[in-house]
Interface confidence: low
């Protein structure tokens, strides 16, 4: 009877579009066939996937966030078959280009400005804001009460992922009109 196999990895937190990961099915055994599955499905045929070492090692080249799935290895001989517990790959990625919401760019004087910035990233990124180039708080949400036309300008959200070493940003123009002079929306 074959033992329950396990999966070892040479990189537990690979970075998207940069790193490769090699999974190895343990233990090494003679006259044994090694198989692999992803999220309960057979391996897709992909140039980024390579089986080696008698199919005992599965290498993922140039990992992407879509590779963050559950990997299972199986072993089989002429007597029995068994498979490992799943190992979920934690792919570090981002931050992607952030999105500022709501999308409105025109506001009435006296309204509250409540801008939220979001960027897809693993782990979650650090957020910071600049208004007309001047650094503001390091928060995901920027709140300014009772804005006036003095608050016109460019609002930039900056995101940084310390794990991937990557940064991103987006800039949004905000126009504040005196009350009653613009069809713009109040926040």
């Amino acid at each position: 009877e074959l033992p329950k196999p396990s999966i070892s990895s040479n990189n537990s937190k690979p970075v998207e579009d940069k790193d490769a990961v090699a999974f190895t099915c343990e233990p090494e055994a003679q006259n044994t066939t090694y198989l692999w599955w992803v999220n309960g499905q057979s391996l897709p045929v992909s140039p980024r996937l390579q089986l080696s070492n008698g199919n005992r090692t599965l290498t993922l080249f140039n990992v992407t966030r879509n590779d963050a799935r559950a990997y299972v290895c199986g072993i089989q001989n002429s007597v029995s078959a068994n498979r490992s517990d799943p190992v979920t790959l934690d792919v570090l990625y981002g931050p992607d280009t952030p999105i500022i919401s709501p999308p409105d760019s025109s506001y009435l004087s006296g309204a509250n400005l409540n801008l939220s910035c979001h960027s897809a990233s693993n782990p979650s990124p650090q957020y910071s804001w600049r208004i007309n180039g001047i650094p503001q708080q390091h928060t995901q949400v920027l709140f300014i009460a009772k804005i006036t036309p003095n608050n016109n300008g460019t609002y930039a959200c900056f995101v940084s992922n310390l794990a991937t070493g990557r940064n991103n940003s987006i800039v949004k123009s905000i126009t504040v009109s005196a009350s009653g002079t613009s069809p713009g929306l109040s926040a």
Epitope: T33, G40, S42, L43, P44, V45, G74, Q76, A81
Partner: nanobody, 124 residues
Amino acid sequence: QLQLVESGGGLVQPGGSLRLSCAVSGDRWDYYAIGWIRQAPGKEREGVSCISSSGRTTNYADSVKGRFTISRDNAKNTVYLQMNSLKPEDTAVYYCSTEFTGWDRCGFDEYDHRGQGTQVTVSS
């Protein structure tokens, strides 16, 4: 290992149709590619068709392409081989076979386990 039981064979006239079934029992059925192979008297075993564990990938021997269709019903643990436009040269014992595989593809060469077979005879 899986247990395989084929059925659906019989005597049919040229141009006729048959539907073979392969009932599969055992653990981890969805980890196996399933294939049909056939052996005519005095001839080598020939791979006919196969279907991957997910059912997304199929393969056919050139001699049956366009006439045979393989499918699998994972809810019923059954693989089917629909055989149309049968010819006398399709006469053989048809075996269902399995491959415990991690690839979402199938082939005819590596199957090491098969059932007892079902006889298909095409004759007028």
